[in-house]
């Protein structure tokens, strides 16, 4: 009679993680009697999946009925597969005795782990930057396998091709991690763009993982002040405007200065608010000429979410207007939104 | 294919240091682990112990506990054996050899080996 | 440690001829066992792992058997390539350990 073999028929095994591995295994024989044990390796360390005969395994099922004594199909399934669970698997026929004896193995069946990669995360940088300065935007994700994997980046649409990708470990692992760094160069008009990290793996199916980064939180867009003087209200009244526009974030505090002295500081609050995301502001100061002999240096002095103040001077000559006397206000704190101006 | 492939023959003195390359290719590096195996001329094979390729963790059987050191590069996808202070008793042909097990915790048998580098020792 | 004790140091042999290899491990090693043929100035070739599974390539004319501590390569048709050293190899345990080798040589 033909000795028994161990026939493993799949030399290899691949599953997603979180489903279940079927690894098969028959023998040609049922002599000798004796139990089937499923182990990991094969090595001093191996380690045992399943003993037919005694012991807890709750994630391996046998496919047939491996008690009935005619059985010899003894195929296992291994439920809720995760990356740690790859390697080799030997099935091996032991011989009945005391204690059983190994008999003959199978050659052994390789068991790879598809697990998808985690939703990637974008970060950008830690402090705001200003157009025309290159920034630099990191996107990780994590879990994945096999190895093989596609990275993208895109700035509204647009694919970036300056970035930089390792992914790790160098070698085989259980599961990767994907690194990627993106130089992108800011614009004006980059309050409303969006950085984009896009991850394709053979788990999503043709449905990649998408990541985002708001520009609207990198990007600091300094304003232009232009510092008018409106025609005069009264005889001894001059209107004087400061117009802060085309600035992003909002945050914004002004201070107007009379030949060096703060006259009036306020913080920007109704806005307006550009196409292009960036914000408009106007502040206005009614100057009483009459209380002034000389020339008056009126500034407009503004500091932008915490940068150091840009300033715009207007230089306003008394000695054009007719001086009221008796009067002792130098300005009156009257207004400083631009829908009131009109 | 899968090729190992060991650096040249040492000619050393008593009291040197050897340090012998393996540079795997073909394969994934990290997924196998690298034994080394020594074989005295006209004599047989010895397991002097191996090293985890992805944790950089290595073993040294017991008669080769002391003098012995394995390592790695993995960027290069080589693994090293170093000797100190070398005796003529060291005088053999050095093999490099690659588990069968992808993720194994121990090694088994060796379906791939190095040609193998003859240190020499004498004074 | 496991010694792995090949008796037969060298083995006469004719071409064609029925030639048997024997091992023995001084314990139980289940089927740990593994074959090698080296041919001079070369590395090992493994030629059977798990006593009795052939390796990948291998011909079919060589034969593992064995469990326990008494384990046989056995060629059966012997080829004039065949002419080499034979290697048992024990991975039951640490440390690995290895024959001391057979030797076959025509007769």
């Known amino acids: 009679e033909e000795e028994l073999q161990v026939i493993q028929p799949d030399k290899s095994v691949s599953v997603a993680a979180g489903e279940s591995a079927i690894l098969h295994c028959t023998v040609t024989s049922l002599i000798p009697v004796g139990p089937i044990q499923w182990f990991r390796g094969a090595g001093p360390a191996r380690e045992l999946i399943y003993n037919q005969k005694e012991g807890h395994f709750p994630r391996v099922t046998t496919v047939s009925e491996s008690t009935k004594r005619e059985n010899m199909d003894f195929s296992i399934s291994i439920s809720n597969i995760t990356p740690a669970d790859a390697g080799t698997y030997y099935c091996v026929k032991f011989r009945k005795g005391s204690p059983d004896t190994e008999f003959k193995s199978g050659a052994g069946t390789e068991l790879s782990v598809r697990a998808k990669p985690s939703a990637p995360v974008v970060s950008g940088p830690a402090a705001r930057a200003t157009p025309q300065h290159t920034v630099s935007f990191t996107c990780e994700s994590h879990g994945f396998s096999p190895r093989d994997i596609t990275l993208k980046w895109f700035k509204n649409g647009n694919e970036l091709s300056d970035f930089q990708t390792n992914v790790d470990p160098v070698g085989e692992s259980v599961s990767y991690s994907i690194h990627s760094t993106a130089k992108v160069v800011l614009t004006r008009e980059d309050v409303h763009s969006q950085v984009i990290c896009e991850v394709a793996h053979v788990t999503l199916q043709g449905d990649p993982l998408r990541g985002t980064a708001n520009l609207s939180e990198t990007i600091r867009v300094p304003p232009t002040l232009e510092v008018t003087q409106q025609p005069v209200r009264a005889e001894n009244q001059v209107n004087v405007t400061c117009q802060v526009r085309k600035f992003y974030p909002q945050r914004l505090q002004l201070t107007w200065l009379e030949n060096g002295n703060v006259s009036r500081t306020e913080t920007a609050s109704t806005v307006t608010e550009n196409k292009d995301g960036t914000y408009n502001w106007m502040s206005w100061l009614l100057v009483n000429v009459s209380a002034h002999r000389d020339d008056v240096k009126l500034t407009c002095q503004v500091e932008h979410d915490g940068q150091p103040a840009v300033s715009k001077s207007h230089d306003l000559k008394v000695s054009a207007h007719p001086k009221e006397q008796g009067s002792n206000t130098a300005a009156e704190n009257t207004g400083s939104n631009e829908r009131n101006i009109y | 294919q899968i090729q190992l492939v060991q650096s040249g023959p040492e000619l050393k003195k008593p009291g040197e240091t050897v340090k012998i390359s393996c540079r795997a290719s073909g394969y994934t590096f990290t997924t196998y682990g690298m034994s080394w195996v020594k074989q005295a001329p006209g004599k047989g094979l010895r397991w002097m112990g191996w090293i985890n390729t992805y944790s950089g963790v290595s073993t040294c059987a017991d008669d080769f506990k002391g003098r012995f050191a394995f390592s790695l590069e993995t960027s290069a996808t080589t693994a090293y054996l170093q000797i100190h202070n070398l005796t003529n008793e060291d005088t053999a042909t050095y093999f490099c050899?690659?588990?069968?097990?992808?993720?194994?915790?121990?090694?088994?048998?060796?379906?791939?080996w190095g040609q193998g580098t003859l240190v020499t020792v004498s004074a | 440690d496991i010694v792995m004790t090949q008796s037969q140091k060298f083995m006469s042999t004719t071409i064609r001829d029925r030639v048997s290899i024997t091992c023995k491990a001084s314990?139980?090693?289940?089927?740990?066992v593994a074959w090698y043929q080296q041919k001079s100035g070369q590395s090992p070739k493994l030629l059977i792992y798990s006593a009795s599974n052939r390796y990948t390539g291998v011909p079919d004319r060589f034969t593992g058997s064995g469990s326990g501590t008494d384990f046989t390569l056995t060629i059966s048709n012997m080829q004039s390539e065949d002419l080499a050293d034979y290697f048992c190899q024990q991975y039951s345990s640490y440390p690995l350990t290895f024959g001391s080798g057979t030797k076959l040589a025509i007769k």
């Open positions: 314990q139980n090693v289940g089927i740990s």
């Open positions: 050899a690659r588990d069968p097990h992808s993720y194994g915790n121990s090694p088994a048998w060796f379906p791939y």
